[in-house]
């Protein structure tokens, strides 16, 4: 999970001590430090809500707090990735949306958040202590997953606050994607810190700013998402598993919100903007070595295929390989 450190409140140096130049060189290391701590570590939040009108109906909302291009979202229930779960929906920004019962409708709310409506009765119906997980595959961050569930005492109609799940796995792609920039910055930071070793350290005081305080990020998440960042995370083991579904590896996917105007529905661009297959099968979304994509098989011990990403935006036939030949 991204460290919740924010830009420390720097006390200005004593008047006349260093002058304008010194002031800048003092601020720069701390900015770089914040970047080193926060950059490249996106976050996923999950919110589960039981509808007041239908007690068997749930709405799951998930969001990705990162600056990369989302290339796949997978929503599952029954546990986090690798812990045994069943895929409810897979959303791909270009190739579409697929959901499985009891999921009724999956959609994009924004370019980086999705919602899923579940409804059912009997064995396939979700219940209050079911754990729902969302996995976002993005470039360059890699795959990030979070889980959440309704608190046992939740009243219908109320929702658990968005849960910033600790990232279960920061895949290699995410690390490599930002390492170049960060390495340079951090080396420079160390250099600056070494230069300032002999000088009095600036006084720091804990940041008392709200979650809306600026972060080292190119854009600001919604207030709801931001407010969620300080909510403790807990995975509640589910005793309410769909009786009709065997255990499977959990995994999720993305889709565009139905009401988004076209001009707002910009699809993710970049090398990972489209997962061209080989295609994972439903049910398991296990990150492969490059940390970008995965496999999906419905139920263990089956494991699905590896999913390869290709940069060609023209689609499934735009590259060589199984999907590249017409």
């Amino acid at each position: 999970m991204r460290t919740e450190a924010q830009v420390p409140a720097l006390q200005p140096p004593e008047p006349g001590l260093e002058g304008a130049m010194g002031h800048r060189t003092l601020v720069l290391p701390w900015v770089l430090l914040t970047l080193c701590v926060t950059a490249g570590t996106p976050e996923v939040w999950v919110q589960v809500r039981m509808e007041a009108t239908e007690l068997s109906s749930f709405t799951i909302r998930c969001g990705f707090l990162g600056s990369g291009s989302i290339s796949l979202v997978t929503v599952s229930w029954g546990g986090p990735n690798g812990a045994g779960g069943t895929t409810l929906a897979v959303l791909h920004p270009e190739r579409g949306i697929r959901q499985w019962a009891p999921a009724r409708q999956a959609r994009w709310e924004t370019q980086s958040s999705i919602s899923l409506i579940l409804e059912g009765s009997g064995a396939s119906s979700p219940c209050a202590n079911t754990t729902f997980c969302c996995k976002f595959a993005s470039f360059p961050e890699g795959s990030w997953e979070a889980c959440g569930s309704l608190p046992p005492s939740s009243d219908p109609g109320l929702s658990a606050p968005p849960t910033p799940a600790p990232i279960l796995r920061a895949d290699l792609a995410g690390i490599l994607g930002v390492s170049g920039v960060l390495l340079f910055g951090c080396v420079y930071l160390l250099h600056l810190l070494r230069r300032h070793k002999h000088r009095p350290a600036p006084r720091l005081q804990p940041s008392r700013t709200s979650p809306q305080a600026p972060r080292a990020r190119a854009w600001a998440p919604s207030q709801a998402s931001q407010a969620a960042l300080h909510v403790p995370y807990a995975t509640i083991n589910t005793s309410c598993r769909p009786a009709t579904l065997d255990t499977a590896h959990p995994h999720g996917g993305p889709s565009w919100w139905a009401s988004l105007p076209t001009h707002a529905a910009h699809r993710p661009q970049g090398p990972a903007a489209w997962a061209s297959t080989p295609i994972p099968a439903r049910g398991s979304f296990v990150s492969v070595e490059n940390g970008l994509y995965a496999q999906a098989g419905e139920r263990p011990p089956h494991t699905g295929p590896g999913l390869t990403l290709f940069p060609d935006p023209r689609g499934p036939r735009a590259m060589e390989g199984p999907l590249g030949v017409r």
């Epitope: 796949l72 897979v90 959303l91 791909h92 270009e94 190739r95 579409g96 949306i97 697929r98 959901q99 409708q105 999956a106 994009w108 996917g253 889709s255 565009w256 919100w257 139905a258 009401s259 988004l260 076209t262 529905a265 699809r267 997962a275 061209s276 297959t277 080989p278 295609i279 994972p280 099968a281 439903r282 049910g283 999906a296 098989g297 419905e298 139920r299 089956h302 494991t303 699905g304 295929p305 999913l307 499934p316 036939r317 390989g321 199984p322 999907l323 030949v325």
Partner: antibody, heavy 119, light 107 residues
């Protein structure tokens, strides 16, 4: 080269059943769901359902539940569709099609199998 | 289920002409609309998905547009190999449904 080779044409009597096959080659069989599509003579396309080759899990169009049964044999990279209680309404060309993630587009198609139901 | 309505059902045109086929969805499908081309006696082939993304080897004279519920496929400067039937399909959840098809014939 990706190929989906379907079994030959079938002429069957009303009330009977028929099982048609679709053998996949040129890609990893478990990398795609196998969809089945019906095309009645001179008409449009209807999605029957699909099967996950990893475990045989199926999804059906409500219209074809009870009519079609989809299965796979991973060892031979072959998908099957059985149609039962056939009537003249079931006379059509049936296609298998490989669907890539998230399994809602038909990326590759078999050549089709013609099923004629006639007494 | 999402219903897909295509028009016109048939269309006659000459080589070199430009034609437009339309497809309407019964509910909002965002940009998740695909087009398939089927030549006489052959299997359908995926042509376009996500409204306007052309699959490999599809000539640039084909272009898709639209969003929400209204979509169209435009073919500029028709070539002999473009004649056949065209089907739209939403890829916004299941069941997958197709339009009734448009038969493009040589005038």
């Amino acid at each position: 080269e990706v190929q989906l080779q379907q079994s030959g044409p079938e002429l069957v009597k009303p009330g009977a059943s028929v099982k048609i096959s679709c053998k996949a080659s040129g890609y990893t069989f478990t990398d795609y769901y196998m969809s089945w599509v019906k095309q009645s003579h001179g008409k449009s396309l209807e999605w029957i359902g699909d099967v996950n080759p990893n475990n045989g899990d199926t999804s059906y169009n409500q219209k074809f539940k009870g009519k079609a049964t989809l299965t796979v044999d991973k060892s031979s990279s072959t998908a099957y569709m059985e149609l039962r209680s056939l009537t003249s309404e079931d006379s059509a060309v049936y296609y298998c099609a490989a669907s890539g993630l998230p399994y809602v587009l038909m990326d590759y198609w078999g050549q089709g199998t013609s099923v004629t139901v006639s007494s | 289920d999402i219903q897909m309505t295509q028009s016109p059902a048939s269309l006659s045109a000459s080589v070199g002409e430009t034609v437009t086929i339309t497809c309407r969805a019964s509910e909002n499908i965002n940009s998740y609309l695909a087009w398939y081309q089927q030549k006489q006696g052959k299997s359908p082939q995926l042509l376009v998905y996500n409204t306007k993304t052309l699959t490999e080897d599809v000539p640039s004279r084909f272009s898709g547009s639209g969003s929400g519920t209204q979509f169209s496929l435009k073919i500029n400067s028709l070539q002999p190999e473009d004649f056949g039937s065209y089907y739209c399909q939403h890829h916004y959840g299941t069941p997958l449904t197709f339009g009734g098809g448009t038969k493009l014939e040589l005038k």
